[in-house]
Interface confidence: low
Amino acid sequence: AGSDSLYVPCAPSPCVNGGTCRQTGDFTFECNCLPGFEGSTCERNIDDCPNHRCQNGGVCVDGVNTYNCRCPPQWTGQFCTEDVDECLLQPNACQNGGTCANRNGGYGCVCVNGWSGDDCSENIDDCAFASCTPGSTCIDRVASFSCMCPEGKAGLLCHLDDACISNPCHKGALCDTNPLNGQYICTCPQGYKGADCTEDVDEGNSHHHHHH
């Protein structure tokens, strides 16, 4: 064979990724690989991920002789072991006056009365626990409820008989029911007074209120 066809193991170097070639015989060589590479020609990047430090669902991303952890949103740090304070990152995490409480791997909301849900955005249905008298209509409010009474019933829970049903107020007086006790209240027209607006007024006082 001609001299131009002589095989020189390290010319050119078969070692890749920065590996250094060393001739070990007439037709043999050895590659000294840089950290992070392996194989007869340093062609393989060693996978640093099988035994890594990424925790709490962190995903390992292999590098050259190193790795990085890609952490889920609620964790941070080199190995995803540090809790993210969502309450600092999201000042409005809790709605409707709820208080944010940071927890390992997440956060929770402590809701004010009348609100519920993960972010306190759900108005609690107070009617579910209300004791409006059957036949009345419950109206849900924030942290409270009110009862709409059918005709003939009165009181906060519509549990009282409406004293105005018997028309106790005379002479065109207005009859209202006291929501606490169900008793009637007469608002007398000009010139009349008394619990039932049956008495004449000597002086010119108008709109007397009488409770009974």
């Epitope: 990085n68 080199q78 190995f79």
Partner: antibody, heavy 117, light 112 residues
């Protein structure tokens, strides 16, 4: 309260093996790497290796590869490290330590291993 | 491996005076995630090391505020602003940016 409690002192002959235990409590065992750090008398600490309790995956300092192994028993939240083919320069205190902040946040009290013929 | 060089080897400081310990790494400790994993430990005789400062300057829980850390890249400092009797110990720096984690040789702090 996070606690790491290690097994007691050991005296071994050269060529023998030693197995040190580290019982963890006060936190979610599978969430944190357990490291092994050794310290020769009058010297600075030296990181030996770690184990990930959730997967059993281990990684060791090149210096101890082939001689050191680590295992966990998740039911008892205990980590173990075994070092074989002991030599006189393996006369050190072995510590277990919990990972956190990319550091070693909580430590066991240490286990003295004496290698002597 | 990354070599961590501490200076001085020992330090004698009067009670109430400032103590400063230096730590230099053989290459930058800035991790690709942007953090610098340089930590400081205190060790008293017969006890395990105790974490004082993590990631350059963050005091670990229960550590008095007379301990502070600073630095960047390859040069870092632990400062005890007013030395107390209970601060007599050996102090170590640790890097965990690069595999394997490596400690400094230690600085012994004594009372003058």
């Amino acid at each position: 309260e996070v606690q790491l409690v290690q097994s007691g002192a050991e005296v071994k002959k050269p060529g023998a093996s030693v197995k040190v235990s580290c019982k963890a409590s006060g936190y979610t065992f599978s969430n944190y790497v357990i490291h092994w750090v050794r310290q020769a008398p009058g010297q600075g600490p030296e990181w030996t290796g770690y184990i990930i309790p959730g997967s059993g995956g281990t990684k060791f300092n090149e210096k101890f590869k082939g001689r050191a192994t680590s295992t966990v028993d998740t039911s008892s939240t205990t980590a173990y490290m075994e070092l074989s083919r002991l030599r006189s320069d393996d006369t050190v205190v072995y510590y277990c330590a919990r990972d956190g902040a990319g550091s070693f946040t909580y430590w066991g009290q240490g286990t003295l291993v004496t290698v002597s013929s | 491996d990354i070599v961590m060089t501490q200076s001085p080897d020992s330090l004698a400081v009067s009670l109430g005076e400032r103590a400063t310990i230096n730590c230099r790494s053989s290459q930058s400790l800035v991790h690709s995630d942007g953090n610098t994993y340089l930590h400081w430990y205190q060790q008293k005789p017969g006890q395990p090391p105790k974490l004082l400062i993590y990631r350059i300057s963050n005091r670990f829980s229960g550590v008095p505020d007379r301990f502070s850390g600073s630095g960047s890249g390859t040069d870092f400092t632990l400062t005890i602003s007013s030395l107390q009797a209970e601060d007599v110990a050996v102090y170590y720096c640790l890097q965990s940016t690069h595999f394997p984690d490596t400690f400094g040789g230690g600085t012994k702090v004594e009372i003058k």
